[in-house]
């Protein structure tokens, strides 16, 4: 439906709120080096105009696009060439290309200060000082850092932030009360930052046709009972809403966002059971909750999926005549019994499936030729449920902290060129797989462990991409969009690769490492591991494991010492002169 | 399992020296650091050195340091301890140890597996 105004009827849509948060979102995401306060007088400038465009909808420039109307506005910033050097560039272009030119200059990971939380009786001044500043703050420091968030979830983040400082700046304890509850909202924030990411690479680097296989997975498991067509319907507008969102036409993505959950609760009787409780929420509420709503029972005595996919003489008709819907039918049809598994397996089975139509199709006897097609799928199903029975035994035995280690240790002799702070970040986020994941019973292990892996490996593939080092991370990340965590679990140790040069000024450590929180300190240690196995990556896990306790014992006791700085520079040496003895560095 | 068995541990005066012994079997003993800890009557068991997997890394409590020497030779998997110019004070069980996979390298949480323990009295 054409609006005479889109400007105008996104503000009436969303309403001001949302819609001057939205704005805000958007240009942070776009220049995520610009100051606080000029963004705040960009998004007052563009609502002062929509207001004009609700007004009179044929008031001048009100009939432009929303790309047309936010990319002047962006293009209108003085230092955009000082800030932000080439991106300056894209103000010569002309829609779409400028939007284009724009989203290829997001950065997954820009150069800004990390964000050191101030003392609750600070943050709670200033939160009742001026609670519409400290919110949209809130809004701006977050996308900046994220420009891939998944902009009307955050509106949902907000509130939740709101409503935690609105209770705990009241409470006795406001630290007991506030800093639990903001740990969650930064680990849950996070986790969506690298879920949305994922959705958002698939969408551009694989295309609308592997989103919506991975949506017709996800939303089948999800809604056993939903007929095909209605998965169809729910996958389509799904898709449009993520592509909205990725592309950062962000007033149209939650508009549409606040459609689809509209549309799925009136029709939750041919959807999901589960789906009651969501729909008595608020609308941000509402949405998130549908996201996260659990899988509904499976209908009883589903048929075998052999009588029509393998069986039947009319699979290569079938296929022939409509080849992504027979597909995708397929697809909907074994996601729905099969909750058990991970969206990825379902779409490498579904991926073996077209495969073996293509071929044999073509051949002279077709069914003679796919009826073993289901016998191809077992080595495919094997190879994650003992790849997680292995690494949940590992982790057991380890606990997270070591678990991680391990995976250091081994991503680092696979891909040692990637940069130590993406290796230590990116096995870190991998080593929570354990906690994550194992603690579940075996029929949910897998979905919970490889969708999760997925994620995090799409979070190594879009930091190597702004600086590529490694062909092997690039193929992996490049060649299937499924397959990646197969592909990295398939490399081995890369011989190719040159130790690092011995460089005495990486394991120096000072005094600082003692007020560090525990997380941080182990990141420390987990930084020096990734060096240590730079330097040399042909030490054995036991070596490997003897220096880390030399070292976990150095800091101990520099950290007990009198004068503390004095013992680092000491004992720091003998021990890089000892590890270096023992490994030949 | 492990099995570490201390030696060396006797009476004697003070000023002198003794030298202790422990001899490991069992798991890897090359790939661990090993402590030396000792318990005197009514007191709770205290750190005294430890030397690293390789035997080129020592830390020592400061009550024994400049005094005692910690070394290894991981061919014969022994560990053993100089202790020189003794005193009365020194008078305890010493125990060797294997380091375990977590906890504190100077707390006997820290460690795994322990010797029987070997008696040193220095008579004043």
């Known amino acids: 439906d054409a609006h005479k105004s889109e400007v105008a009827h996104r503000f009436k849509d969303l309403g001001e709120e949302n819609f001057k948060a939205l704005v805000l979102i958007a240009f942070a995401q776009y220049l995520q080096q610009c100051p606080f306060e000029d963004h705040v007088k960009l998004v007052n400038e563009v609502t002062e105009f929509a207001k004009t465009c609700v007004a009179d909808e044929s008031a001048e420039n009100c009939d432009k696009s929303l790309h047309t109307l936010f990319g002047d506005k962006l293009c209108t910033v003085a230092t955009l060439r000082e800030t932000y050097g080439e991106m300056a560039d894209c103000c010569a272009k002309q829609e779409p290309e400028r939007n284009e030119c724009f989203l290829q200059h997001k950065d997954d990971n820009p150069n800004l200060p990390r964000l050191v939380r101030p003392e609750v009786d600070v943050m709670c001044t200033a939160f009742h000082d001026n609670e519409e500043t400290f919110l949209k703050k809130y809004l701006y420091e977050i996308a900046r850092r994220h420009p891939y968030f998944y902009a009307p979830e955050l509106l949902f983040f907000a509130k939740r932030y709101k409503a935690a400082f609105t209770e705990c700046c009241q409470a006795a304890d406001k630290a007991a009360c506030l800093l639990p509850k903001l740990d969650e909202l930064r680990d849950e924030g996070k986790a969506s930052s690298a879920k949305q990411r994922l959705k958002c690479a698939s969408l551009q680097k694989f295309g609308e046709r592997a989103f919506k296989a991975w949506a017709v997975a996800r939303l089948s498991q999800r809604f056993p009972k939903a007929e095909f067509a209605e998965v169809s319907k729910l996958v389509t507008d799904l898709t449009k809403v993520h592509t909205e969102c990725c592309h950062g036409d962000l007033l149209e993505c939650a508009d549409d966002r606040a459609d689809l959950a509209k549309y799925i609760c009136e029709n939750q009787d041919s959807i999901s059971s589960k789906l009651k409780e969501c729909c008595e929420k608020p609308l941000l509420e509402k949405s998130h909750c549908i996201a996260e709503v659990e899988n509904d029972e499976m209908p009883a005595d589903l048929p075998s999926l052999a009588a029509d996919f393998v069986e039947s003489k009319d699979v290569c008709k079938n296929y022939a005549e409509a080849k992504d819907v027979f597909l995708g039918m397929f697809l909907y049809e074994y996601a729905r019994r099969h909750p058990d598994y991970s969206v990825v397996l379902l779409l490498r089975l579904a991926k073996t499936y077209e495969t073996t139509l293509e071929k044999c199709c073509a051949a002279a006897d077709p069914h003679e030729c796919y009826a073993k097609v289901f016998d191809e799928f077992k080595p495919l199903v094997e190879e994650p449920q003992n790849l997680i029975k292995q690494n949940c035994e590992l982790f057991e035995q380890l606990g997270e902290y070591k678990f991680q280690n391990a995976l250091l240790v081994r991503y680092t002799k696979k891909v040692p060129q990637v940069s130590t702070p993406t290796l230590v970040e990116v096995s870190r986020n991998l080593g929570k797989v354990g906690s994550k994941c194992c603690k579940h019973p075996e029929a949910k292990r897998m979905p919970c462990a490889e969708d999760y892996l997925s994620v995090v490996l799409n979070q190594l593939c879009v930091l190597h991409e702004k600086t590529p080092v490694s062909d092997r991370v690039t193929k992996c990340c490049t060649e299937s969009l499924v397959n990646r965590r197969p592909c990295f679990s398939a490399l081995e140790v890369d011989e190719t690769y040159v130790p690092k040069e011995f460089n005495a000024e990486t394991f120096t450590f000072h005094a600082d490492i003692c007020t560090l929180s525990e997380k941080e300190r182990q990141i420390k240690k987990q930084t020096a591991l990734v060096e240590l196995v730079k330097h040399k990556p042909k030490a054995t896990k036991e070596q490997l494991k003897a220096v880390m306790d030399d070292f976990a014992a150095f800091v101990e006791k520099c950290c007990k010492a009198d004068d503390k700085e004095t013992c680092f520079a000491e004992e720091g040496k003998k021990l890089v002169a000892a590890s270096q003895a023992a490994l030949g560095l | 399992q492990v099995q570490l068995v201390e030696s060396g541990g006797g009476l004697v005066q003070a000023g002198d020296s003794l030298r202790l012994s422990c001899a490991a079997s069992?798991?890897?003993?090359?790939?661990?650091?090993m402590g030396w800890f000792r318990q005197a009557p009514g007191k709770e068991r205290e750190f005294v050195a430890r030397?690293?997997?390789?035997?080129?890394?020592?830390y020592y409590a400061d009550s024994v340091k400049g005094r005692f020497t910690a070394s290894r030779d991981n061919a014969k998997n022994t560990v053993y301890l100089q202790m020189n110019s003794l005193k009365p004070e020194d008078t305890a069980v010493y125990y060797c140890?294997?380091?375990?996979?977590?906890?504190?390298?100077?707390?006997?949480?820290?460690?795994?597996?322990w010797g029987q323990g070997t008696q040193v009295t220095v008579s004043s």
């Open positions: 140890a294997q380091r375990g996979d977590s906890g504190s390298n100077y707390d006997p949480s820290g460690y795994s597996y």
């Open positions: 030397i690293n997997w390789s035997g080129t890394l020592t």
């Open positions: 069992g798991r890897t003993f090359s790939g661990y650091a």
